[in-house]
Amino acid sequence: APTSSSTKKTQLQLEHLLLDLQMILNGINNYKNPKLTRMLTFKFYMPKKATELKHLQCLEEELKPLEEVLNLAQSKNFHLRPRDLISNINVIVLELKGSETTFMCEYADETATIVEFLNRWITFCQSIISTLT
């Protein structure tokens, strides 16, 4: 059974992940970003189901494409280089989903834009956080 300290740690990690994803979304959603229209043509894979921490496997598998698009964004809104930002997210995701069980991610039939993709994972974080508090 999870202890209160492990629950607290999970909550903090989710909050950190949530902030990182929100920062990316704000950075690319900036109305001054002329590249947004072009960036929206990139096809992101969405999870068929995202209700548990193990489903973060689906986010982990999309971090490489996310880094590519962020390199194209070149937004001044990001305090870190895309490579460092994605690396930070990857560390959190690995800790949260754990490495004990190998979960095969199932993707939805429809792809999504980067905005839809980020919103989906932001909602996921918020949902899990709400169950922990």
Partner: antibody, heavy 117, light 106 residues
Framework: QVQLVQSGAEVKKPGASVKVSCKAS????????MHWVRQAPGQGLEWMGR????????KYAPKFQGRVTMTRDTSTSTVYMELSSLRSEDTAVYYC??????????WGQGTTVTVSS | DIQMTQSPSSLSASVGDRVTITCKAS??????LAWYQQKPGKAPKLLIS???SLETGVPSRFSGSGSGTDYTLTISSLQPEDFATYYC????????FGGGTKLEIK
Amino acid sequence: QVQLVQSGAEVKKPGASVKVSCKASGFNIKNTYMHWVRQAPGQGLEWMGRIDPANGNTKYAPKFQGRVTMTRDTSTSTVYMELSSLRSEDTAVYYCGRSRGYAMDYWGQGTTVTVSS
Amino acid sequence: DIQMTQSPSSLSASVGDRVTITCKASDHINNWLAWYQQKPGKAPKLLISGATSLETGVPSRFSGSGSGTDYTLTISSLQPEDFATYYCQQYWSTPTFGGGTKLEIK
């Protein structure tokens, strides 16, 4: 695993048309863009255009506009590139490639098209 | 169309050498650049996208840098399997490729 398998070599006469196919496996073509790039003997790479298999939308390089047609058959996970009014300068290896957005991460093995009278 | 000028067009180097290939765009391409490696009789292989993002499985001796109109592919320590032709490709506007750099054994 991801694979793109192209149709075999073609020999055509000037003025004719050629239709090259590219069959995908290991992924859903609707979740990608499919591009066509050609390479004349001893020359560099030349982007011809792309199709979005999800809706059939195409974007062609200005040089090929009006002469190239890209289509797809999602039921067989196959994309096609047809080039009309062939001339000797169209002799090249034609590659299909896939992308999630921009850079092509997987390519077909290439199809040699020879235009000769 | 944006023109991509790649230099040098050919280059002789030895195993272990550090090699740099440059690509200059005729207009700003804002990091929307990829690098490919092609061996004779084979299809190109994607090495780097977004100017700096190394593809999964590509050795870390390959790296990309640059901004605006000027971009660079660096191979920190040449290996025998790296001798090939390298192409840059911009995709800020209608995609165009550089003329290629043939990397040969000295």
